[in-house]
Interface confidence: low
């Protein structure tokens, strides 16, 4: 047997989840705007066709999408974190980030939450995103378990302006493929992820168009094995 055959046999026998898949959203969205947030998030008040809800729907159809675990949304977790009183802290001397497990001299941010949605306003949103992405979850259970550093530290790009405000750029949403055992599974998973991403791109841009701000974005999937299977999708047309 070739090493590849042996590899597939071991996958078949021992694995119950496939490779991670990342749905990357290119920069251009104004995440501090509530209408834009509703196009991404997956909690109450979010759009039924939001990115999170579409990824959830894709996971519910694994035979076609090959997605086994719905991706987590950093945005929803940021909303949770901002609403918990023991999460966001700062140093009063220079207003810089303070870890959630620190006592004095650190103080609670007291993030003002607005509307029925109970989300930070635009200024507060941009002020505290970097804090969320630096915050390490407290494993004691009594502290802040929603810190975003481990889960999303690499998932959210942002640029600072005015020293205290962060503008969020490109982001990704990590899920998992189903167990992939054969070459057919691998290139079908790539095809399925691309179709999901194309639907997300189309929906987000359609909804952005209604905002009349001229922004267009792109969603594309990435997993470590895609580069090896891309040619499978065009093999027949390429040979003709």
């Amino acid at each position: 047997d070739s090493f590849q055959t042996k590899y597939f046999q071991y996958l078949n026998r021992y694995l119950n989840i496939g490779p991670p898949v990342y749905f990357v959203v290119t920069e251009g969205l104004n995440y501090s705007d509530m209408d834009t947030q509703n196009m991404i998030c997956g909690t109450r008040f979010c759009r039924p066709d939001s990115l999170s809800m579409q990824l959830y729907a894709a996971y519910r159809n694994p035979n076609e999408t090959y997605i086994a675990q719905p991706p987590n949304s950093w945005l929803d977790d940021y909303f949770d974190w901002s609403a918990l009183p023991n999460c966001c802290k700062y140093f009063p001397s220079n207003s810089s980030f303070c870890p959630n497990d620190r006592g004095a001299p650190c103080k609670a941010c007291g993030i003002a939450l607005e509307g029925d949605e109970q989300r930070p306003n635009s200024t507060e949103f941009e002020r505290y995103v970097p804090f969320f992405l630096q915050d390490i979850p407290d494993t004691s259970g009594s502290g802040c378990v929603k810190g975003g550093h481990a889960a999303y530290g690499q998932a959210v790009n942002y640029k600072m302006f005015n020293k205290t405000q962060a503008h969020v750029g490109a982001t990704y949403y990590q899920g998992y493929h189903t167990v992939l055992k054969t070459s057919l599974d691998y290139y079908s998973a790539l095809k399925g992820a691309r179709e999901v991403a194309a639907n997300l791109t189309e929906t987000l841009n359609r909804n952005l168009k209604h905002q009349l701000n001229g922004t267009t974005i792109n969603v594309f999937p990435y997993s470590v094995f895609y580069v090896f299977y891309e040619q499978y999708l065009t093999m027949w047309p390429d040979t003709l």
Epitope: N16, Q69, N72, S73, D80, T139, G148, Q174, Y176
Partner: nanobody, 125 residues
Framework: QVQLQESGGGVVQPGGSLRLSCAAS????????MGWFRQAPGKEREFVAT????????YYADSVKGRFTISRDNAKNTVYLQMNGLKPEDTAVYYC??????????????????WGQGTQVTVSS
Amino acid sequence: QVQLQESGGGVVQPGGSLRLSCAASGRTFSSYVMGWFRQAPGKEREFVATISTGGGTTYYADSVKGRFTISRDNAKNTVYLQMNGLKPEDTAVYYCAAKMATGTASIRTYEYAYWGQGTQVTVSS
């Protein structure tokens, strides 16, 4: 694929206790974050508690904090929910759920990939 089966539900008087169990099939139970949710008649399914893969981190809904305790035994592929000081408003179908260890402490139903069938808990005098 993980199959989940809840047990331990029943009828109990206010102030009483129950211990729910959720048995999981599958070789890699310890790689899943586990959660308990509940759904009362005519209401949405709501988060109760979650526990990390190794059991070191737990998180509870405010409504059950101090009364309910979530724990897990990875050797037995089982997660538990010890419910003390039960109140009539705790009456619901309780569901066990599992997800891969991504994101932060998970309190949303849509983050969980696998669900049990549920077990009925009724608190009544």
